[in-house]
């Protein structure tokens, strides 16, 4: 089941899923002056069986001038060096993607994509927050958001992390004041709704990382 | 109480376009995508796409790709759609729909006739 | 796209009568959601996530099923379930509905 709202903003982080729930949709987005192919894939989707999830269909850019060119989906060598570097470190990966069993990797990139990825995830789905370059984690708990389903409706917890700024004199864990969930859903609305917000990864917090080359949106 | 509240029902002419708004109230108009539902006169239900008012982000159905833009005044907690060309077959009530998992609240529906 | 193809078309029953609505999907999805449209109306949520009554939804209305076959039932039809029924998917863009049951008067 489709989230139908976006992981919960934490100011001066970024989050990144480390693997992808099967049903998982990326857009087949490409850069300007490049197109889908006709009769192309409009998304990837996260498929698969009990023992192996890949990505269906492939995502193919041409040029928006040329009708009969069809761009390679196979990254050169450059191109998949440079979109590894944007990726979240090693250390702050929980788990091998790997060895998650109904999750797919990041697909690698095809050639004239688009400079960010739009994905849909799933009911299931889990991201990591870490705190942009130059703060500091503070956490009282997890620094992941699920998303859930409650009463039919989606909702993503909230992760336990507050970013610092290093120069900033910080408080201690226990003594933060809470974090709330901006742009929250009012509980009171109906009994069966829990706090949520409706956010879309920050491409202003994603562009204050040095290694930043692409950024990611989750839809 | 959530309501979401539709403009009424248009005449057009074939080739123009229309606008439909939808004003939503009783609750966070940022923090849900607002969808939108086409169904012609004695048809079925079809998606048409969703905006997410906070940033302005659409996804379509690719059938309603050229045909519908949807759009969000945060300032005023509406949401528009406007279908561009339009042509006789357009002729339907479009509804929109709060999302956020199930369709739970749904505007009256805004009636659209495209006639020479 | 999942095509959602519900059966039948239309049903005519009575009052009373035990009414069963199936749908089925192109691809296996993870829930069904049933909406009921009366005449002139927008259409109103009745089950989610496959058997979860919406609030306000009499105990007569059921739904089941997993995979690609669900099934709507109503144990005994009252004369306010008189209407058209939508299943719908919501595991995979685009989003897509079945294309409706009547339910109509024998």
């Known amino acids: 089941e489709l989230c139908d709202d976006d992981p919960p903003e934490i100011p001066h982080a970024t989050f990144k899923a480390m693997a992808y729930k099967e049903g998982t949709m990326l857009n087949c987005e490409c850069k300007r002056g490049f197109r889908r192919i006709k009769s192309g894939s409009l998304y990837m989707l996260c498929t698969g069986n009990s023992s192996h999830s890949s990505w269906d269909n492939q995502c193919q850019c041409t040029s928006s001038a040329t009708r009969n060119t069809t761009k390679q989906v196979t990254p050169q060598p450059e191109e998949q060096k440079e979109r590894k570097t944007t990726e979240m470190q090693s250390p702050m990966q929980p788990v091998d993607q790997a060895s998650l069993p109904g999750h797919c990797r990041e697909p690698p990139p095809w050639e004239n994509e688009a400079t960010e990825r739009i994905y849909h995830f799933v009911v299931g789905q889990m991201v990591y927050y870490q705190c942009v370059q130059g703060y500091r984690a503070l956490h009282r708990g997890p620094a992941e958001s699920v998303c859930k389903m409650t009463h039919g409706k989606t909702r993503w917890t909230q992760p336990q992390l507050i970013c610092t700024g290093e120069m900033e004199t910080s408080q201690f864990p226990g003594e933060e004041k809470p974090q709330a969930s901006p742009e929250g859903r009012p509980e009171s609305e109906t009994s069966c709704l829990v706090t949520t917000t409706d956010f879309q990864i920050q491409t202003e917090m994603a562009a204050t990382m040095e290694t930043s080359i692409f950024t990611t949106e989750y839809q | 109480q959530v309501q979401l509240v539709q403009s009424g029902a248009e005449v057009k002419k074939p080739g123009s376009s229309v606008k439909v708004s939808c004003k939503a109230s009783?609750?966070?108009?940022?923090?849900?995508?607002m969808h939108w539902v086409r169904q012609a006169p004695g048809q079925g239900l079809e998606w048409i796409g969703y905006?997410?008012?906070?940033?302005?982000?659409?996804e379509y159905n690719q059938k309603f790709k050229d045909k519908a833009t949807i759009t969000a005044d945060e300032s005023t907690n509406t949401a528009y759609m406007e279908l561009s060309s339009l042509r006789s077959e357009d002729t339907a009530v479009y509804y929109c729909?709060?999302?956020?998992?199930?369709?739970?609240?749904w505007g009256q529906g805004t009636l659209v006739t495209v006639s020479s | 796209d999942i095509q959602m193809t519900q059966s039948p078309s239309t049903l005519s029953a009575s009052v009373g009568d035990r009414v069963t609505i199936t749908c089925s999907a192109s691809?296996?999805?993870?829930?069904m959601h049933w909406y009921q449209q009366k005449p002139g109306k927008a259409p109103k949520l009745l089950i989610y996530t496959t058997s979860n009554l919406a609030s306000g939804v009499p105990a007569r209305f059921s739904g089941s099923g997993s995979g690609t076959e669900f099934t709507l039932t109503i144990s005994s039809l009252q004369p306010d379930d008189f209407a058209t029924y939508y299943c719908h998917q919501r595991s995979t863009y685009p989003l897509t509905f079945g294309q409706g049951t009547k339910v109509e008067v024998k």
């Open positions: 691809s296996s999805i993870s829930y």
């Open positions: 009783g609750y966070t108009f940022t923090s849900y995508r």
């Open positions: 729909a709060r999302g956020g998992g199930v369709f739970d609240y």
């Open positions: 905006i997410r008012p906070k940033r302005g982000y659409t």
